[in-house]
């Protein structure tokens, strides 16, 4: 190598990461196997759960503003879940990115796209509910499914825009032990006259901007919307939170718990540029909190189901009935199970004034099983607690 050979310029923290070597420690290998297993399971669960949510909410329910929000959240989570198998592969081959630079950029971008999209969509849901309560007349006139879709498109565009720097500055870096990292390289584009200054300013800018835009601002919007709604409903003498409120509260709590640690470590990482003593903590903690953030996409569909009232009781009670009705022949569909469903349907209709499904006919065979898997939320049109939970938006 010549004296002036251009080594790829790396920020100090990144160069030090490239110097970390793998251990052949047995206990560490067991942890790696467990991590691969856990991420593989999460990949599968995330894809199936979010796929089912998209199918049921998108195809088997009448489209409302609320189902639109859930649909887009599930789409974001499905994208993230679809990228998880590649992260699992990265873990399986010994924490080495073997899929090339372009795919490294794309894979990482999906993670950040999900981060921004989730934050923005949860903000929109909270603002939507706030407007319904604080400006009911305006909401009545302007709150349409088409408008919600347009808002979602704008939010997706904003999320994509915010993801661009993460796409640009993602790179594959060879470690000294032969493994390949897929990580930030903020010196990749126009490093400027002073690398140290560029490293510091860009790392801080990325960490602070994502913390503010994808976490703090959305949580502030959610909190202030909730406060405004609570104040208004207090005046109306309402005490018990509605079903949709519980669903949103659960999803927001999961968002805060899953993404909060990631942002803390991301800020610590930016601080570690000037304070190398923080680096070991960041190196140890970041993989765990990144996985936790990924798992948010797996947790959300579970929350949609679990926030259905009487869910577990209904599941236990209807297990035998559902299995019977799924296994009966199409010619036998006029029997007792069917009439029992029709009775439930009428009570559900009286419980919620809204028609909740775009298909009036009884779903058959696999569709019914899918519905049951979702906790009877969409097993038959216009029944099911999820339908009601997703509809009673002002409660």
């Amino acid at each position: 190598m010549s004296a002036n050979a251009t080594l790829k310029p790396l920020c100090p923290i990144l160069e030090q990461m490239s110097r970390l070597q793998s251990h052949s420690n047995t206990s560490i290998r067991y942890i790696d196997h467990a991590a691969v297993l856990l991420h593989g399971l999460a990949s599968l669960l995330g894809l199936v759960e979010n796929g089912v949510i998209l199918f049921v909410v998108g195809c088997r329910m009448r489209q409302t503003v609320v189902t639109t929000w859930v649909l887009h959240l599930a789409l974001s989570d499905l994208l993230a879940s679809a990228s998880l198998p590649f992260f699992t592969y990265f873990l399986a081959v010994g924490h080495s990115w073997e899929l090339g630079t372009t795919f490294c950029k794309l894979h990482s971008s999906i993670f950040f796209l999900n981060m921004f999209a989730s934050g923005f969509l949860l903000s929109a849901i909270s603002l939507d509910r706030c407007l319904q309560v604080v400006r009911p007349v305006w909401a009545q006139n302007h709150r349409t499914v088409a408008a919600a879709h347009k808002v979602c498109l704008v939010l997706w565009a904003l999320a994509v825009l915010n993801t661009v720097p993460y796409f640009v500055f993602r790179d594959t870096i060879s470690r000294l032990d032969g493994r390949i990292m897929c990580y930030y390289n903020v010196l990749l584009l126009n490093p400027g006259p002073d690398r140290d200054a560029t490293c510091n300013s860009r790392q801080v800018a990325l960490a602070v901007s994502k913390f503010l835009l994808a976490f703090l601002v959305p949580l502030a919007i959610i909190a202030s919307s909730h406060a405004a709604v609570s104040l208004r409903l207090q005046h109306r003498g309402r005490r018990r939170p509605g079903r949709f409120v519980r669903l949103v509260a659960a999803v927001v709590a999961a968002f805060a718990l899953c993404w909060g640690p990631y942002h803390v470590f991301s800020l610590l990482e930016a601080r570690a540029h000037a304070n190398p003593g923080l680096r070991p903590l960041v190196w140890r903690g970041l993989p765990f909190v990144t996985s936790l953030a990924f798992f948010n996409s797996v947790a959300n569909p579970v929350l949609y189901v679990l926030t259905c009232p009487d869910m577990l009781r209904k599941l236990r009670r209807s297990l035998r009935t559902v299995l019977e009705s799924v296994l009966v022949d199409d010619s036998e569909l006029g029997g007792a199970g069917s009439s029992r469903r029709r009775r439930t349907s009428s009570t559900a209709r009286s419980a919620s004034p809204l028609a909740l499904c775009s298909r009036p006919e009884e779903p058959r065979g696999p569709a019914r099983l899918l519905g049951w898997l979702l906790g009877s939320c969409a097993a038959s049109p216009q029944t099911g607690p999820l339908n009601r939970a997703l509809s009673s938006t002002s409660s």
Epitope: A3, N4, L7, P9, L10, C11, P12, E15, Q16, R19, L20, Q21, L176, G192, P193, D194, R195, D196, A197, P276, G277, R279, P280
Partner: antibody, heavy 118, light 107 residues
Framework: EVQLVESGGGLVQPGGSLRLSCAAS????????MSWVRQAPGKGLEWVAY????????DYPGTVEGRFTISRDNSKNTLYLQMNSLRAEDTAVYYC???????????WGQGTLVTVSS | DIQMTQSPSSLSASVGDRVTITCRAS??????LAWYQQKPGKAPKLLIY???QLASGVPSRFSGSGSGTDYTLTISSLQPEDFATYYC?????????FGQGTKVEIK
């Protein structure tokens, strides 16, 4: 060929000042971080100052902080070390060294001797 | 500050001998260690960087190993030109400190 040539050493009284220079050639000076390292007669090596490639970041060990100042002029391909309030224990051969990347001194000058004595 | 303790401080060996010099840091330095060779009246020369990586133009008889706090420089077959003083230096947290040196002399 990479060359680092130090100059400015000499005899100085305790409490006095001295400015060392290091002329660089054979590489793109503005692309590399630089350091000064010293070696007291018959003793080991001691790192004394660091400066980033653009000059925005400097660092010093506690033994010289506040007394020594590292700087660079990328247009002149020159590194400097301003030494104030010199003490007898600062007597050493001072080397300028180029950082391979962020660390690791891959090229050194031949050194200049600084003697602090009354 | 991180202390670097080199051992032995001096050793006598013959041409063709296998020589091992160790360097212990007072805390984990995560492979951020370099080894230098210095001959009398000359500037130090980089041999090994990042604990295990051979610097450009350095003969393959030199090798580095170790992790955490303990690192080793090995000369597999000592040559006449290898009689010199060897220093380790960490690049973890500033101040970047050197070991006190190991003088390799002819037996």
């Amino acid at each position: 060929e990479v060359q680092l040539v130090e100059s400015g050493g000499g005899l100085v009284q305790p409490g006095g000042s001295l400015r060392l220079s290091c002329a660089a050639s054979g590489f793109t000076f503005s692309s590399y971080s630089m350091s000064w390292v010293r070696q007291a007669p018959g003793k080991g090596l001691e790192w004394v100052a660091y400066i980033s490639n653009g000059g925005s970041t400097t660092d010093y060990p506690g033994t010289v902080e506040g007394r020594f100042t590292i700087s660079r002029d990328n247009s002149k391909n020159t590194l400097y070390l301003q030494m104030n309030s010199l003490r007898a224990e600062d007597t050493a051969v001072y080397y300028c060294a180029r950082h391979r990347t962020n660390w690791d001194f891959d090229y050194w000058g031949q050194g200049t001797l600084v003697t602090v004595s009354s | 500050d991180i202390q670097m303790t080199q051992s032995p401080s001096s050793l006598s060996a013959s041409v063709g001998d296998r020589v091992t010099i160790t360097c212990r840091a007072s805390e984990n330095i995560y492979w951020n260690l370099a080894w230098y060779q210095q001959k009398p009246g000359k500037a130090p020369k980089l041999l090994i960087y990042a604990a295990t990586q051979l610097a450009s133009g350095v003969p393959s008889r030199f090798s580095g190993s170790g992790s955490g706090t303990d690192y080793t420089l090995t000369i597999s077959s000592l040559q006449p030109e290898d009689f010199a003083t060897y220093y380790c230096q960490h690049f973890w947290i500033t101040p970047w400190t050197f070991g006190q040196g190991t003088k390799v002399e002819i037996k």
